[in-house]
């Protein structure tokens, strides 16, 4: 059965009111599925299936956040499972469309400060940890949507109201217009339009690629900052290793971001992290006398 | 049904420190948030903080920031609160409460307490 | 902080009387407030969530009003077993906080 978060209201499953047409269905292959005699078909896809208890931990992680952000406490979470439910249930897995999520996107509705906006590219968790610490700035998963769906994954199949358990389309061995692509290309891009002032990005140095043009920072992200609006983009380049010293800020992909950026009439800085646990550690205690020098 | 099991009374020397435990059965343990209150002997209830076990993250009330570490581990569905530099002002029983969903932002459900004493 | 101030700090109540306590909060916490039981030696016991609702299997003597900043818990039909601590908490803002508790003892 359900958990106790569910008493009151158990989850229903319904068809999609209406389905689209579908021009492109994948390279999945088709599996048997069932029993009988006859065949029930399962597209078969190359990348991992949906989530356990997707449907549970969607709920309860909504729950969770309008318990610790009382800001969103207007917030109906059955209403927004509802929406996300309604998103990608009873739709091929490729052709999914911003569009699908403008319901969802409408309830999870936040206003975050402008000008406290963290991206990141490659290095989630240290990011994360930065904004657990320094509780006035805002990654994508601090706001309520990317709470929701953070390191989950979710499909459906089209015409059938069943969530596949079992595979789901691989952004490049499938399709790009999968239910988990859409709806971060979608929220990253209402996020990087939402910035102002100075923009931080969080960048990982270990990376061949410190900047990646094909990452959602890189694709979706940087061709979404508002030249209006946002004043400098400034990269936080994290270094690994204990003896690097070399600045990273002269990287040929650094220098390549620095191009997109002011030719969109943003300016540029770079800054090295060259020591990310003291970084982090000066950011908790900024009186420390170590955290004067140079981090 | 829903049970938070708190450890046993505990005895701290004035700068030491105690760890309290809150053992979560009856629903998963990532998908609730754990709260801690505290409550001096014969004095009301203050609330010290939260903790969301999934990802670790924690929100403590000014006044226990210096004082309390909120953790949680979710392969034993277990919470825990690290109380450092014990003083007699830190004697009191401590619970674990969490909420639920569809009734508010109340706790209607608490660990049976487990009591600091500070003495040396 | 919100300052949760409940009043009176104790009442000296007979079985099957009517008891009335208040809780005023230093700002506006909508309906935001919860209020609690708890009898020497027990975990603190939800009766009333988000001012006016009363929580699972809590008897219907016991209710809740109010919004704002000024709300009121009161008993009907006092039992012997009502005996106990009653408090209030605002669950509107971080940190929550608690009203300092009414004592109820009989005559």
């Known amino acids: 059965g359900l958990n106790d978060i569910f008493e009151a209201q158990k989850i229903e499953w319904h068809e999609g009111s209406h389905h689209h047409h579908h021009h492109h269905h994948g390279s999945g292959s088709l599996v048997p599925r069932g029993s009988g005699s006859v065949p029930r078909w399962r597209q078969q896809w190359s990348g991992p299936g949906t989530t356990k208890r997707f449907p549970e931990t969607v709920l309860a992680r909504c729950v969770k956040y309008t318990e610790i952000h009382p800001e969103m406490r207007h917030v109906d979470c059955q209403s927004v499972w509802d929406a996300f439910k309604g998103a990608f249930i009873s739709k091929h897995p490729c052709n999914i469309t911003e569009e699908d999520y403008q319901p969802l996107m409408k309830l999870g509705t936040q206003t975050v400060p402008c000008n406290k906006i963290l991206l990141w590219s490659r290095i989630k968790d240290l990011a994360h940890q930065f904004t657990q610490v320094q509780r006035d700035m805002f990654t994508l998963e601090d706001t309520l949507l990317g709470y929701l769906a953070d390191d989950l994954t979710w499909c459906g199949e089209f015409n059938t109201s069943k969530i596949n358990y079992q595979s789901c389309p691989d952004w490049r061995k499938d399709c790009s217009n999968n239910p988990v692509s859409v709806f971060w290309k979608t929220v990253s891009r209402r996020f990087a339009e939402a910035a102002c002032d100075v923009v931080h990005v969080m960048l990982n140095g270990s990376r061949s690629k410190i900047f990646d043009k094909n990452s959602t920072f890189g694709s979706v992200e940087v061709h979404n900052l508002q030249p209006e609006k946002v004043q400098t983009l400034e990269a936080w380049v994290i270094h690994g290793g204990r003896e690097d010293s070399r600045d990273l800020c002269q990287d040929p992909t650094i220098k390549e971001l620095e191009s997109i950026i002011s030719k969109r009439n943003i300016q540029f800085s770079c800054k090295n992290i060259y020591r990310p646990d003291k970084f982090l550690q000066c950011v908790k205690n900024p009186e420390d006398s170590s955290c004067t020098s140079e981090i | 049904e829903v049970q938070l099991q708190q450890s046993g009374p505990e005895v701290g020397r004035p700068g030491s420190s105690v760890k309290i435990s809150c053992k979560a059965s009856?629903?998963?343990?990532?998908?609730?948030?754990m709260n801690w209150v505290k409550q001096s002997p014969g004095q009301g209830l203050e609330w010290i903080g939260w903790?969301?076990?999934?990802?670790?993250?924690?929100d403590v009330a000014e006044k226990f920031k210096k004082k309390a570490t909120l953790t949680a581990d979710s392969s034993s569905s277990t919470a825990y609160i690290y109380l450092s530099g014990l003083t007699s002002e830190d004697t009191a029983t401590y619970f674990c409460?969490?909420?639920?969903?569809?009734?508010?932002?109340?706790?209607?459900?608490w660990g049976q307490g487990s009591l600091v004493t500070v003495s040396s | 902080d919100i300052v949760m101030t409940q009043s009176p700090t104790s009442i000296s109540i007979s079985v099957g009387e009517r008891v009335t306590m208040n809780c005023k909060a230093s700002?506006?916490?909508?309906?935001?407030v919860d209020w609690y039981q708890q009898k020497t030696g027990q975990s603190p016991k939800l009766l009333i969530y988000?001012?006016?609702n009363r929580y699972t299997g809590v008897p219907d003597r016991f209710t809740g009003s109010g919004s704002g900043t000024d709300f009121t818990f009161t008993i009907s039909n006092m039992q012997a077993e009502d005996l106990a601590v009653y408090y209030c908490?605002?669950?509107?803002?971080?940190?929550?906080?608690f009203g300092g508790g009414t004592k109820l003892e009989l005559k």
């Open positions: 009856g629903y998963t343990f990532t998908d609730s948030v």
């Open positions: 988000k001012a006016s």
């Open positions: 903790i969301d076990p999934e990802y670790g993250r924690t």
């Open positions: 409460a969490r909420t639920k969903y569809n009734s508010g932002y109340g706790f209607p459900y």
């Open positions: 908490m605002q669950s509107n803002t971080h940190p929550r906080t």
């Open positions: 700002q506006n916490v909508d309906s935001d």
